[in-house]
């Protein structure tokens, strides 16, 4: 676990999970619904997601220097995602297998979230928007795009952490 | 098995308040919406609301704001519906029920409205 | 709200009719429409989901059609324990409405 004053996390314990996360991401995302997508949804239906940016230091040079920015935003984005899998948008019609990885996914996300949270302080969590109700209608367009988008952060994510055990870990 | 059982029938007078429960068994509690359906006798089935139990959100038909407020308890795989300032027009069976597209129902509370 | 209208509101049949229900929509709900039974005194149990989906445990003799705002839940041959009523309902969107229910009885 991380611990407050700028230490570093579990690297090794965080690539794990990460890899993890990549897997299951990947794995979920054919299975959000029970038909094709239809042209309903083409307007951009998902709210501004979090992406890993050039500023955020999760380049080799910002996690050497100061990792704790770059651990942030990935923390953040954990968090927006793990509202997001335990929304209805998956929980809601059309049903999920019962045997489906998006419950294990919003689990794996909320485990590296609490991995990375320092003991005894809090980071800043960007606001996390109140999902209104999504319509079951929207459902299948909407998981289509935040599974997308979360294996693209997470992919981002495990590189990161791979990173870090490789050349940070104590 | 999937099993939603709902707590016995009730006698309430007009004005009071009861609460209803659903205790869900075979399944992951949080992995689905629970809903609250109701049957006055004789008539047609009226969607009264729904909660999601791993988010804790609620969704309402508008004409049961005010007249239900509905609950889940992780713990004990547990929703339940407050109905308050009751009526005879609140006579009626009540049921729980998952998504609809898993077809799981709950046997039904009936609630009588009497003075 | 998306109203469901069903068609007739009461069906007398001789056992191994053939038999349609009909359920309209106020608006097009795609195919997000779920047929259910209802016996006298017991729960509703889901027959058909997104219009044509079997469900497990469901006799073959009950079938689903219609996308859009038209839809028919077909039996295609009659027993005496289909008697009950049978309701339409939308899944496509808030508030969530079933039909006013077709009763289905035995002559």
């Known amino acids: 676990r991380a611990v407050p004053g700028g230490s570093s996390p579990a690297w090794t314990q965080c690539q794990q999970l990460s890899q993890k996360l990549c897997t299951l991401a990947w794995s979920a995302h054919p299975l959000v619904g029970h038909m094709d997508l239809r042209e309903e949804g083409d307007e951009e239906t998902t709210n501004d997601v979090p992406h890993i940016q050039c500023g955020d230091g999760c380049d080799p040079q910002g996690l050497r220097d100061n990792s704790q920015f770059c651990l942030q935003r990935i923390h953040q984005g954990l968090i927006f995602y793990e509202k997001l899998l335990g929304s209805d948008i998956f929980t809601g019609e059309p049903s999920l297998l019962p045997d489906s990885p998006v419950g294990q996914l919003h689990a794996s996300l909320l485990g590296l979230s609490q991995l990375l949270q320092p003991e005894g302080h809090h980071w800043e969590t960007q606001q996390i928007p109140s999902l209104s109700p999504s319509q079951p209608w929207q459902r299948l367009l909407l998981r289509f795009k935040i599974l997308r988008s979360l294996q693209a952060f997470v992919a981002v994510a495990a590189r990161v952490f791979a990173h870090g055990a490789a050349t940070l870990s104590p | 098995q999937v099993q939603l059982q709902q707590s016995g029938a009730e006698l309430a007078r007009p004005g009071a308040s009861v609460k209803l429960s659903c205790k869900a068994s075979?399944?992951?509690?949080?992995?689905?919406?629970l809903k609250w359906v109701k049957q006055r006798t004789g008539q047609g089935l009226e969607w009264i609301g729904e909660i999601h139990p791993r988010s804790g959100n609620t969704h309402y038909n508008e004409k049961f704001k005010g007249k239900a407020t509905l609950t889940a308890d992780k713990s004990s795989s547990t929703a339940y519906m407050d109905l308050r300032s009751l009526t005879s027009e609140d006579s009626a069976v009540y049921f729980c029920?998952?998504?609809?597209?898993?077809?799981?129902w709950g046997q039904g509370t009936t609630i009588t409205v009497s003075s | 709200d998306i109203v469901l209208t069903q068609s007739p509101a009461t069906l007398s049949v001789t056992p191994g009719d053939r038999v349609s229900l009909s359920c309209r929509a106020s608006?097009?709900?795609?195919?997000?429409l779920h047929w259910f039974q209802q016996r006298s005194h017991e729960s509703p149990r889901l027959l058909i989901k997104?219009?044509?989906q079997s469900i497990s445990g469901i006799p073959s003799r009950f079938s689903g059609s219609g996308s859009g705002s038209d839809f028919t839940l077909s039996i295609n041959s009659v027993e005496p324990e289909d008697v009950g009523v049978y309701y339409c309902?939308?899944?496509?969107?808030?508030?969530?409405?079933f039909g006013s229910g077709t009763k289905l009885e035995i002559k």
């Open positions: 997104y219009a044509s």
């Open positions: 029920a998952t998504n609809w597209d898993l077809g799981y």
């Open positions: 075979g399944y992951t509690f949080t992995s689905y919406s």
């Open positions: 309902q939308n899944g496509h969107s808030f508030p969530f409405t």
């Open positions: 608006q097009s709900i795609s195919d997000y």
